[in-house]
Interface confidence: low
């Protein structure tokens, strides 16, 4: 342990103020003390100290607070938590939402580094489950957060908690997150009348079953093509044709520019040449006249 | 690193004005903290005006007063107006920015300022 330097006479520090920014490292040290700092430091963040004061800020709470800094503490904070690592922030206890705000507004406008993963993950775990409030919270500030967590990590997240869910918060995710997002934005929406009910669960479907994309069918529902193609593959095959023009309505004629992509591409290969004719749209790759069209699941079986 | 290019140092007589001017590489809303530091001859370079993101500023007790600092994000600069200026405000002029979270601060190559009774 180094030997500690006296404060000068006169420059103890009576409250955090601008006048700290003039202090050189060593000052800081010997004449601020942390117990001031911790209760006063709502004012760190509008005193625009160098990052090297930072540290030796940040220095002092650490040595106050060993075993992880109180939360009253940790809410003020401000640029501070920038110094932070993931080892600091995994000692804390972060309960209210206010403080999560406060950190991430801090980190606004950056990419999701270690220490805001790291804050997220204690404060969910804390909670127990991803409440609304908290998915509102960090989908705000980080659209793509939904689709960062496991499918195992989601299936944490309640029925109610999806109508915090915007379009744009499901980019990112993939067809194993889908499934398990998917049912709970359709028990979240079930009790809205059908075109609502669309435009909510519009951007789930990328998870639905066949049974449900053939319900979809019957209710003129024209889905456009870029719902479509992130349907699930194994989720359209089994659907008609006459299922499909219906369920995307006047976007039907977008079929042909996508015919070599899937799933439209398989889904061709599964229809008779004769119904994909009755589109008009020189669709072609279908099941010639007279060929038997086995059921995919018996074909899996003799296969 | 953020580039910072200084310029509007020169001579002045004692009561005049000058104004600094720092324009910065990256956008100033990645910016934590800006400063103006002032170097006479001799090894120590001192804090002059700050501002905080959040548009806080402070001065140096030299220069409250006469000194005000201000910022425009969308031009990405900072100024420093310099009025009823002294001949010990004659020194070589820097930009500095501080960057928390990559713990760095950044500095503009200076621009003189020389003050004369």
């Known amino acids: 342990e180094v030997e500690k330097t006296a404060c000068p006479s006169g420059k103890k520090a009576r409250e955090i103020d601008e006048s700290l920014i003039f202090y050189k490292k060593w000052e800081l040290e010997a004449c601020v003390d942390a117990a001031l700092l911790a209760t006063q430091m709502d004012r760190v963040n509008a005193i625009p100290f160098t990052y090297e004061q930072l540290d030796v800020l940040k220095h002092k709470l650490d040595e106050l607070y060993p075993q992880g800094y109180p939360e009253s503490v940790i809410q003020h904070l401000g640029y501070l938590f920038l110094k932070m690592s993931p080892e600091d922030i995994r000692k804390w206890n972060v309960t209210s939402l206010e403080t999560l705000k406060a950190l991430l507004e801090v980190n606004k406008g950056h990419e999701m580094s270690p220490q805001v993963a790291t804050l997220i993950d204690r404060f969910v775990k804390g909670r127990g489950q991803l409440d609304k409030d908290t998915l509102d919270t960090l989908t705000a500030f980080y659209p793509g957060y939904l689709c960062s967590l496991s499918p195992e990590e989601l299936s944490s997240v309640p029925p109610s908690s999806i109508w915090a869910v915007r379009p744009q918060d499901l980019d990112t995710c993939d067809p194993r997150q889908l499934d398990v997002l998917y049912p709970k934005a359709r028990l979240a929406f079930q009790n809205m009348n059908g075109s609502e009910y669309f435009v909510k669960i519009q951007s789930f479907l990328g998870g639905a079953p066949t049974e449900d994309l053939k319900a979809l069918s019957q209710q003129n529902v024209s889905m456009d093509l870029a719902t479509f193609m992130k349907l699930r593959t194994d989720a359209v095959l089994p659907l008609t044709v006459a299922e499909v023009q219906k369920l995307l309505g006047p976007h039907v004629e977008g079929l042909k520019a996508e015919e070599r992509h899937r799933p439209v591409r398989d889904w061709i290969l599964r229809q008779r040449q004769d119904d994909l004719d009755t589109l008009g749209l020189g669709l072609q790759g279908g099941i010639p006249n007279g060929y038997l069209v086995l059921d995919l699941s018996m074909q899996e079986a003799l296969s | 690193q953020v580039q910072l290019v200084e310029s509007g140092g020169g001579s002045a007589q004692a009561g005049g004005s000058l104004i600094l001017s720092c324009v910065a590489s990256?956008?100033?809303?990645?910016?934590?903290?800006l400063g103006w530091y002032r170097q006479a001859p001799g090894p120590k370079r001192e804090l002059v005006a700050a501002?905080?993101?959040?548009?806080?500023?402070y001065y140096a007790d030299a220069v409250k007063g006469r000194f005000t600092i201000s910022r425009d994000t969308l031009t990405k600069t900072m100024w420093l107006q310099m009025n009823n200026l002294k001949p010990e405000d004659t020194a070589m002029y820097y930009c500095?920015?501080?960057?928390?979270?990559?713990?760095?601060?950044?500095w503009g190559m200076g621009t003189q300022v020389t003050v004369s009774s």
């Open positions: 500095a920015a501080e960057d928390y979270g990559l713990g760095q601060r950044s």
């Open positions: 990256a956008n100033l809303f990645t910016i934590d903290a």
């Open positions: 501002i905080s993101s959040g548009g806080n500023k």
